[in-house]
């Protein structure tokens, strides 16, 4: 069937519309378009003869129409008057006619709307505001936006006049927002510019800051007042009821006790005509003196002396406070406070007691801190350490040893070789050493203040031949699946290569084996019983090589789940029951038995002569390894039958 489709159906003024023809018959002579719902020669727009491809305008032709060979009609620059029906008249070659009607609607392109308001400065909780969207346009829909969101649901918001007017009743400061209106019709949508609603409000009750109401004599008083208000409030200050100044801030330098009193801030809004006040009471206290700390011993000796720190001056009815390292006092038996907290005593001082220490005097409104005091604790010297840690050197190299001991004041150092004093320096340097430089090297550290001395002796061997190495271990009895073991090849020697063997083989590749410290240390992580092997380390340089004696790792493991033998579980009455329990374990485990939950004997073998059906039950073997701290057990059910009642039963032992 012949049909007409309007594309688009809703057309904007000034745009184009295409009346598209569907199902056009074959073998046509021509066709004609008419304005309206019927064929009317006076309302013919255009005709088209297919044979000549000639378009002929009719009485209703406006110069804006184009007819296509497929009978579709394009109308340009649409005007409001074009709205309505259009009829296509098709003339077939057999001169039989066919008609179809289509239609479209024309809408204006909407202008950009604007918002008018009946009240540009409404007062909070008093006024209403009516916004109207201009201009009034036929067939247009009106929408409103607040802060680019659709209108919230509120009993104070009312739409009227076909949604063209938005009324806000009893405006509040929260209605201060961006308002936009939008006009829509089927062909266009336009949004207005924002209108910001300026709601007059306040002043609210002012707030005075800071909230602090207690001050010390000599301080500056700086009060600030703020009240929510639109337009911003005008402020006035009153002290004890007397007007001071019309400012938002009140500043009084170097206050005295006489400045105590009631301070009032008044906020005024000239547009709303409202006033609000807030009062705060200020108290000014006399200034106490700044405390300081005295000490009965300025250079105490570690582990020997006590120190008493006293907070000065002494003031009656005053609370004294103490801080160490900017923290309140820790609980310690070495710290003692006097009854009035004024004196802090440190019993048997250590090097960690240096401080700083502060004391404080608490008054009505604050705490006054003393300057910090640091204790000069004399300590040491500790046992000196000689570095580097090498004990073996080759001839011809330089020997450079350094000594250090923790000490206050810093230690004075002396070096001795084989008991003979060499020099009073922290470092000892001997160039181009020979075998004759082998010997005992002693570093002596002396603290002149405490009078204490400490020494460390190191054996230095100078030899072209490497010594026989030895293996030291950090764990002689590691527990399986728990401990790690670090083997170290001694001694530490310069320019030396370290090698390792396990059971006479080079080290296997394993994620549990790790070499470190220039291959001098071999670490076994998460040891297993299979790691109980012979470990040998070797050292070599360009002229010699040597191997250590083997060290066998004693891995503690188990006990594993025990096994009860024999495996039989059925016995004849009168037989002997002889059960043996075994569990893999290092060291060997302790064994115990329970029959039907009742403890029996602490042996590996359980023997019961001439059993009867009364010996039926559960037989449990418990194993315990005191070294690993682990336990294990197994349960076996034993059935004893009366003689001759059941074939195939064990005769027992």
């Amino acid at each position: 069937k012949l049909t007409i489709e309007s594309t688009p159906f809703n057309v904007a003024e000034g745009k184009e519309v295409l009346l598209l023809v569907h199902n056009l018959p074959q073998h046509l002579f021509g066709y004609s378009w008419y304005k309206g719902e019927r064929v009317d020669g006076n309302r013919q727009i255009i005709g088209y003869v297919i044979g000549t491809q000639q378009a002929t305008p009719g009485p209703a032709y406006s110069g804006r129409e184009i007819i296509y060979p497929n009978a579709s009609l394009l109308i340009q620059n649409i005007i409001q008057n074009d709205t309505g029906f259009y009829t296509l008249h098709v003339i077939k070659s057999d001169l039989v006619n066919e008609e179809a009607t289509g239609q479209f609607r024309v809408y204006p392109e909407l202008p950009k709307p604007s918002i008018s308001s009946n009240n540009s400065k409404p007062v909070e909780d008093k006024d209403a505001v009516a916004f109207t969207c201009e201009p009034e346009t036929q067939d247009a829909t009106y929408l409103w936006w607040v802060n680019n969101q659709s209108l919230p649901v509120s009993p104070r918001l009312q739409l009227s006049n076909g949604n063209r007017t938005l009324t806000l009743f009893n405006v509040t400061r929260n209605d201060t927002a961006s308002y936009k209106c939008e006009t829509q019709n089927p062909v266009s949508a336009r949004r207005s510019d924002s209108v910001i609603l300026n709601v007059l409000y306040g002043p609210d009750a002012p707030t005075i800051s800071p909230l602090n109401t207690s001050y010390r004599s000599g301080e500056n008083l700086n009060l600030s007042c703020h009240a929510a208000s639109n337009p911003p409030a005008q402020y006035s200050w009153f002290v004890n009821g007397t007007f001071q100044q019309s400012t938002q801030e009140l500043f009084i330098p170097n206050i005295t006790v006489n400045n105590s009193g009631s301070y009032t801030c008044q906020a005024h809004n000239s547009d709303t005509g409202l006033n609000r006040t807030t009062v705060t009471t200020i108290t000014v206290y006399a200034e106490p003196p700044k405390p300081f700390i005295t000490s009965n011993n300025s250079n105490p000796v570690e582990d020997e002396d006590a120190v008493a720190l006293t907070c000065e001056p002494e003031i009656q009815n005053t609370t004294y406070l103490w801080w160490v390292n900017n923290q309140s006092l820790p609980v310690s038996p070495r710290l003692q406070l006097s009854n009035d907290n004024r004196t802090l005593t440190l019993l048997s001082v250590t090097r960690n007691d240096v401080g700083p220490y502060e004391c404080g005097i608490q008054n009505e409104l604050s705490v006054d801190h003393s300057d910090p005091v640091i204790l000069n604790v004399l300590y040491g010297p500790d046992d000196p350490t000689i570095s580097p840690s090498y004990t073996y050197y080759r001839p011809g190299v330089n020997l450079s040893l350094s000594c250090h001991a923790a000490s206050n004041p810093p230690a004075q150092y002396s070096w001795l070789i084989d008991g003979n004093i060499q020099q009073h320096t922290q470092e000892l340097f001997i160039s181009n050493i020979t075998e004759k430089n082998s010997g005992l090297y002693t570093c002596q550290a002396n603290n002149s203040a405490s009078g204490h001395s400490r020494t460390t002796v190191k054996t230095i061997t100078v030899s072209a031949e490497l010594p026989k190495p030895s293996i030291s271990s950090n764990n002689s009895k590691p527990v399986e699946d728990k401990d790690a073991v670090a083997f170290t090849c001694e001694p530490e020697a310069q320019n030396t290569t370290y090698l390792w063997w396990v059971n006479g083989q080079s080290l296997p590749v394993s994620p549990r084996l790790q070499l470190s410290n220039g291959n001098r240390t071999l670490t076994l992580f998460n040891v297993t019983r299979n790691d109980a092997r012979a470990y040998v380390c070797g050292i070599q340089n360009s002229v010699s090589a040597n191997r250590s004696d083997p060290v066998t790792l004693d891995v503690l493991y188990g006990p594993d789940t025990p096994i009860i033998s024999p495996p039989d579980s059925s016995y004849l009455s009168g037989a002997n029951l002889n059960l043996s329990c075994h569990s893999a374990s290092n060291p060997s485990p302790q064994y115990s038995w329970r029959i039907n939950g009742i403890p029996q004997q602490h042996t590996q073998v359980l023997f019961i002569a001439k059993i009867t059906p009364n010996n039926n039950g559960t037989y449990a073997c418990f194993v315990s390894n005191l070294a690993t701290g682990r336990n294990n057990s197994i349960v076996k059910s034993i059935t004893v039958s009366a003689s001759g009642t059941s074939p195939g039963l064990s005769a027992g032992a």
């Epitope: 255009i46 032709y61 110069g63 184009i66 394009l74 340009q76």
Partner: nanobody, 119 residues
């Protein structure tokens, strides 16, 4: 009655210029698109230029771009085609037509005016 009357054709040497006029009656050219169509023997009809006053734009066939200029005087309800740098291949009968603003289609009327480019 709707009428389109073309004028301004004639004989011109290659490289020369001509100005064609299209006087419209029975409708306002400011409401539609006016185009110039040319027909030459053995060649396809070609819409060489169109002007849509109500849309504010003009368009040209690639073959005449930079040489032809279409314009309209709405007070006289007349459209013009200024033809410069004419070539022998521009020889044709030029018709004034109602053109589509959305494609290359048109309906034409009138007698047309002949343009001959020859030395």
């Amino acid at each position: 009655e709707v009428q389109l009357v073309e004028s301004g054709g004639g004989l011109v040497q290659p490289g020369g210029s001509l100005r064609l006029s299209c006087a419209a009656s029975g409708f306002n050219i400011k409401d539609t698109c006016i185009g110039w169509v040319r027909r030459a023997p053995g060649k396809e009809e070609e819409l060489v230029a169109a002007i849509c006053e109500y849309k504010g734009y003009t368009r040209y066939a690639d073959s005449v771009k930079g040489r032809f200029t279409i314009s309209a005087d709405t007070s006289k309800n007349t459209a013009y085609l200024q033809m410069n740098s004419l070539r022998a291949e521009d020889t044709a009968v030029y018709y004034c037509a109602i053109a589509s603003p959305v494609d290359q289609y048109y309906n034409y009327w009138g007698q047309g005016t002949t343009v001959t480019v020859s030395s």
